[in-house]
């Protein structure tokens, strides 16, 4: 006899990186017929919801209207059908950004390189932090972690046209509190036409949408959304 229900999916909208004082919604998708959902924060019950009518709803949204460092951390959710509870979801790391200062991002040898050249990004922040994060915008976003007293370097190695795109970096005061994002650096990698057609640039956002850290402007694919978050967040652990 089954003792627990399958774990729900958890993700944040518009993104798991939330500028301070902005709003974020934590979504928990379980099963139709679930009579109760619980959201746990750092191991303690944070919010409860009983969707109505349960047979027509398989997802609840927990709303955080005003993000701050107190709300940043690890969230998980569970749901109940009758008296049977689900396994807990994967952990969602909710990060507060726009804390304190803005780092500077630079690239060596420069923003325009030839395929095969070695490229290194440098993220610098003169305040008390020793961990830095480099993010590439786009659907298949990559997050890299680096360490250093005031600067971290991120060697990309010999680049290909797949490395083209817009990069930003953050200083991290702890796993869940990050600085303002740096100004963007757009990396242009030139290669032969055949390579370029095989490795199109990741879709990037218009500059104004980056402020809300949207993953993509038109994804309805919540599980893809959750999968991206999960991939990026593995670097936080």
């Amino acid at each position: 006899q089954q003792q627990t229900l399958p774990k729900p999916f958890i993700w944040a909208e518009p993104h798991f990186m939330v500028p301070k004082e902005k709003q974020v919604t934590i979504c928990c998708q379980g099963n139709y017929g679930a009579v109760e959902y619980q959201l746990h924060f750092e191991g303690s019950l944070f919010a409860v919801d009983r969707p109505k009518p349960p047979e027509r709803i398989n997802k609840v949204q927990f709303y955080i209207p005003d993000m701050n460092s107190r709300m940043a951390g690890q969230y998980s959710c569970i749901y109940r059908v009758g008296e049977l509870w689900s396994e807990p979801s994967n952990l969602l790391d909710l990060v507060v950004t726009e804390m304190y200062d803005t780092p500077t991002l630079s690239v060596h040898p420069g923003p325009e390189v030839i395929s095969g050249e070695k490229v290194t990004f440098y993220c610098r922040l003169d305040t008390a932090t020793s961990m830095f994060l480099l993010l590439k915008e786009g659907r298949s976003s990559h997050v890299q972690r680096g360490y250093g007293k005031v600067q971290a370097e991120f060697p990309l190695g010999p680049v290909t046209t797949a490395h083209r795109g817009t990069y930003r970096c953050f200083g991290s005061y702890n796993n869940h509190a990050w600085s303002f994002p740096s100004e963007p650096v757009k990396l242009l990698v030139t290669g032969d036409i055949e390579n370029t057609s095989l490795a199109p640039e990741d879709p990037t956002f218009p500059a104004d949408t980056w402020g809300t850290y949207l993953l993509t402007t038109e994804t309805g694919l919540q599980k893809d959304h959750a999968l991206w978050d999960h991939t990026a967040q593995n670097l936080l652990r």
Epitope: F46, V48, D49
Partner: nanobody, 129 residues
């Protein structure tokens, strides 16, 4: 501005009953959460029972074990907590609180006290053995 005024506290023997009331005024939102929290000396406030006006949907702490019932009289804007089978360990200061719902649908409630922006002054409940 939102005002919450509790009443109904007092002293009672173990096994007895009390009914706490909280008169609410000034809340403009259609959906919101109200709750009863309690505080022991030197400790943080802990949730006792919550109710969401959109349901209304009720949520209880495990220690309540069916002994307490939270209810809301919308016509009178009064929140109540009927406490039966009281135990000496229920002795505490009881507070009424109000805050936003945890979802846009209005059917959920936050649990931590810091998510509630309006508080009453508290009413003391003392249960003697």
């Amino acid at each position: 501005d939102v005002q919450l005024v509790e009443s109904g506290g007092g002293s009672v023997q173990a096994g007895g009953s009390l009914r706490l009331s909280c008169a609410a005024s000034g809340y403009r939102s259609r959906h919101y959460c109200m709750g009863w929290f309690r505080q022991f000396p030197g400790k943080e406030r802990e949730r006792v029972a919550l109710i969401n006006t959109g349901g209304p949907t009720t949520f209880y702490a495990d220690f309540v074990e069916g002994r307490f019932t939270i209810s809301l009289d919308n016509a009178k804007n009064t929140l109540s907590l009927q406490m039966n089978s009281l135990k000496p360990e229920d002795t505490a200061m009881y507070y009424c609180a109000a805050g936003p719902p945890s979802s846009d649908s209005g059917s959920g409630c936050y649990v931590p006290e810091y998510m509630y922006n309006y508080w009453g002054q508290g009413t003391q409940v003392t249960v003697s053995s």
